[in-house]
């Protein structure tokens, strides 16, 4: 799996898109986690509706949003008042019994300034020599943090 | 074992510019992030800010914003910190230090520093 | 900006005995904390991140804890070679800062 990088502005919220194929996916749960340590599992933050069909439903852990377009084979994360602890290695993964597979693997940059990331264009990429091959930088919409957010503390 | 060797040290005059490097070997430099931070009088640590390795995104304090200026070359897995219009305020020791993606701002090896003297 | 304040500049210890070296965010950084030791002329070095993870290769004696705003890193089993500065940072909240530091200095 290559990584896709989404990056975001503290403060603000960060939209991640994870597309899959409906059809493979049918009838699949799908989950959010970070990956915490360079070994051992990925941790689990949200995960879609426990019903397949509510799947549509958003569910928040924290500050954290998981729905799914299990028509469309879209699964969309939002990370609300993003921070810089929220940066790191993150995974979306599509559930069956106790097993997961990756739809995807996503970096979270949390750039301080909106100012900060360099214009599409402009953008920097790693050669194909590198480990990370075909880095896809995204740059989410996102908007102002509303008063009272709390940010969510990383798993343990 | 993960190295990052800094330039020497720098003796400058008030006005100038001065452009530290930090060169990484024995990892991968583009699945990192590179961060500078300033200590002062062997106490005060201050973070400066950050370049990714992966993107080339940075992340500045707001306090050495238009005074610091990052950038990376890849193909020498090197990183380097331009800072301008130097003042006394700016002798220090600077270093660079590595995070990972997992933990993007716990900085597992750091360069040896490099000392800026500022004189007029 | 968040203001990380190490209350003791200077602890004193013996070798063997345990030490605690305490760390109070201004604010609430969740468990977004790391701790570094630094000896004379030399680097910092990472210990602890996430406010409890030990880094790669840190001796067990080191241990992190602390959510919120109260932080310690304690040092069982003090050694000779533990002598050093110790300071801890907060990544919750940009700018990412730094305590002023705890010197651990022979008794």
């Known amino acids: 799996h290559n990584t896709t990088v989404f990056q975001g502005v503290a403060g603000q919220s960060l939209q991640v898109s994870c597309p899959y194929d409906s059809m493979k996916h049918w009838g699949r749960r799908k989950a959010w986690c970070r990956q915490l340590g360079e070994k051992g599992p990925c941790q689990r933050v949200v995960s879609t509706h426990n019903l397949w069909l509510l799947s549509f439903l958003r569910r928040w852990n924290g500050s954290t949003a998981i729905t799914d377009d299990t028509l469309g084979g879209t699964l969309t994360i939002t990370l609300r008042n993003l921070q810089p602890h929220d940066a790191g290695l993150y995974q979306c993964q599509s559930l069956h019994g106790s097993e997961a597979d990756t739809l995807r693997k996503v970096l979270v940059e949390v750039l301080a300034d909106p100012l900060d990331h360099r214009d599409a264009g402009d953008l920097w990429f790693p050669g194909e020599s590198e480990s990370f091959e075909d880095a896809h930088v995204e740059h989410s919409i996102s908007r102002s943090l509303l008063e009272g957010e709390i940010p969510f503390p990383p798993t343990s | 074992e993960v190295q990052l060797q800094q330039s020497g040290p720098e003796l400058v005059r008030t006005g100038a510019s001065v452009k530290i490097s930090c060169r990484a070997s024995?990892?991968?430099?583009?699945?990192?992030?590179i961060h500078w931070v300033k200590q002062t009088h062997g106490r005060s640590l201050e973070w400066i800010g950050y370049?990714?390795?992966?993107?080339?995104?940075?992340s500045y304090n707001q306090k050495f914003k238009g005074k610091a200026t990052f950038t990376v070359d890849t193909s020498s897995s090197t990183a380097y910190m331009q800072f301008n219009s130097l003042t006394s305020e700016d002798s220090a020791v600077y270093y660079c230090?590595?995070?990972?993606?997992?933990?993007?701002?716990?900085?597992?090896?750091w360069g040896q520093g490099t000392s800026v003297t500022v004189s007029s | 900006d968040i203001v990380m304040t190490q209350s003791h500049k200077f602890m004193s210890t013996s070798v063997g005995d345990r030490v605690n070296i305490t760390c109070k965010a201004s604010?609430?950084?969740?468990?977004?904390v790391a701790w570094y030791q630094q000896k004379p002329g030399q680097s910092p070095k990472l210990l602890i991140y996430?406010?409890?993870t030990r880094h790669t290769g840190v001796p067990d004696r080191f241990t992190g804890s602390g959510s919120g705003t109260d932080f310690t890193l304690t040092i069982s089993n003090v050694q000779s070679e533990d002598l050093a500065d110790y300071f801890c940072?907060?990544?919750?909240?940009?700018?990412?800062?730094f305590g002023a530091g705890t010197k651990l200095e022979l008794k």
């Open positions: 230090a590595r995070s990972t993606m997992i933990a993007p701002y716990g900085m597992d090896y």
């Open positions: 024995s990892y991968s430099f583009t699945d990192n992030y």
């Open positions: 370049i990714s390795g992966y993107t080339g995104a940075t």
């Open positions: 604010q609430d950084v969740v468990t977004a």
């Open positions: 996430w406010a409890s």
């Open positions: 940072q907060q990544y919750s909240r940009y700018p990412l800062t």
